[in-house]
Every structure is written in C-alpha cells, then in structure tokens.
C-alpha cells in the first residue's frame, strides 16, 4: 500500500489580476463519497493552510464565504482557483486530498504547484 497519488501542475503563473488556477487530480483507491481538499502553501520553511473544502461526490465544492479559493469538481478532478494573490504570495501550493467516507481513510499529497505572482506595474499618469 502506498500513499494515494495526487497530480497537479508543476508551475502556474498568476494573471495580472492576481488569479491563479490549477487542476488537482487524485487516483481514488475506492469509491469515496466524501472528499476533503486542502490547499497548503510552503514558502521560507513555513507551511500555512490557504483554504479547505469538503464535498460530496457529484456536488459542488464549497469553500467558506471569506475564502480566497473557489473550485469545481468533476469525478476525481478538482479545478481550483485562488484569487487576490500578490507578489509576496509566490510559493509552492500543495494539494492535499483526503477520502473521508466511507472507510478506509486515504490521504494523498501532490508534489506542489509553484505559483508565481507578479504585481502589475502602476499605470503612468497621463497628461490628458
């Protein structure tokens, strides 16, 4: 028995509006009906939880109202979007997937997506 495999892209560049999207796909060893997805950020030897959501298979992924994440699910694939990113948020974003129900419990952790965020240059003042 090995850890559940979780795949995610190696690198993503956030948009000029500070939005980054990536897919987190997991190889489910069983027929899970309740799945928990957590996005973790590792940078400068610190690990912080960015957001988390639990969803029932076939239903929408629901994050807390004040979460910077949104997402949709389709089978064993979760499409994640993180917004409000700034240059200081550049780091390795890791997808953690837990199959909560029915037993047995499984845990999988992706290899991380390096998200690069570049703050847009302020528009120069115009003389019009």
């Amino acid at each position: 028995c090995k850890a559940m495999h979780v795949a995610q892209p190696a690198v993503v560049l956030a948009s000029s509006r500070g939005i980054a999207s990536f897919v987190c796909e997991y190889a489910s060893p069983g027929k899970a009906t309740e799945v928990r997805v957590t996005v973790l950020r590792q940078a400068d030897s610190q690990v912080t939880e960015v957001c988390a959501a639990t969803y029932m298979m076939g239903n929408e992924l629901t994050f807390l109202d004040d979460s910077i994440c949104t997402g949709t699910s389709s089978g064993n694939q979760v499409n994640l979007t993180i917004q409000g990113l700034r240059a200081m948020d550049t780091g390795l974003y890791i997808c953690k997937v837990e199959l909560m129900y029915p037993p047995p419990y499984y845990l999988g952790i992706g290899n991380g997506t390096q998200i690069y965020v570049i703050d847009p240059e302020p528009c120069p003042d115009s003389d019009f």
Partner: nanobody, 127 residues
Framework: EVQLVESGGGLAQSGGSLRLSCAVS????????IGWFRQAPGKERETVSC??????SYADGVKGRFTISRDTAKNMVYLQMNSLKPEDTAVYYC??????????????????????WAQGTQVTVSS
C-alpha cells in the same frame, strides 16, 4: 489501508525515561514520514519529532532529550524520551504523511501534512 497503533505511554518521574512505540500496518515505512505529536490539556497539538528514510527532525524543546528511530524490518517507529520534564506531560500521537521531495528539515514534521493518526497514548511526568 494504513493504520498506526502506539504503545509505551505511562507515568514517569521528572528526569526519567520512557520509550514510545508506533506500529505501522498496511504499508512499508518507506513511502511515509512518521511523526510524533503531543497535545497537553487546553493546548493545541504540537510537533515533537519525525523521521523518514534519510533524516530525522526535532522540535526545539526536545532536541538533545528525545531520539526518534525506525526499524523497517518490524515496521516500527520509536520515540526514546530521556530527561523528562513535567511540561512533557501530554497525550502523544504518532501519525503518517506521504514522503515528498519538497519537504525540508523544517517542514517535514508540519502537522498540516499528516493525515493517518493513531489513537494517542498518555504520558504523565510527575515532579
């Protein structure tokens, strides 16, 4: 299915020793980091130590007093606790995390990465 079972907790005098054991079933040890965590009453669960194939890491408060080791033939991980202090009193948990290339010495023990948890064993250190 990965399962972990601890043993070895109990009562010790200040300055004494205890050895905790964590038996891992359902997998070999190699794909995982095995960590020890503890939770004192009214406090958050905190990292004690963890170990993978290549290295071990310790929380600052236990360095030099606690030693983590693993026996791959028996699928066991041990936590040898020496020079115990009353503040070491807590429920101790062993847990497993998939071993990842991006883990550093500072992050491989981070509680966010763990998901397979044992039931916990009480350690009480009396003064």
């Amino acid at each position: 299915e990965v399962q972990l079972v601890e043993s070895g907790g109990g009562l010790a005098q200040s300055g004494g020793s205890l050895r905790l054991s964590c038996a891992v079933s359902g997998s070999t040890l190699d794909p995982f980091v095995i960590g020890w965590f503890r939770q004192a009453p009214g406090k958050e669960r905190e990292t004690v130590s963890c170990i993978n194939r290549n290295r071990a890491s310790y929380a600052d408060g236990v360095k030099g007093r606690f030693t983590i080791s693993r026996d791959t033939a028996k699928n066991m991980v041990y936590l040898q606790m020496n020079s115990l202090k009353p503040e070491d009193t807590a429920v101790y948990y062993c847990a497993a995390s998939p071993d990842k290339a991006f883990y550093t010495d500072q992050t491989m023990c981070n509680i966010h990465y763990y998901g397979y948890w044992a039931q916990g064993t009480q350690v009480t250190v009396s003064s």
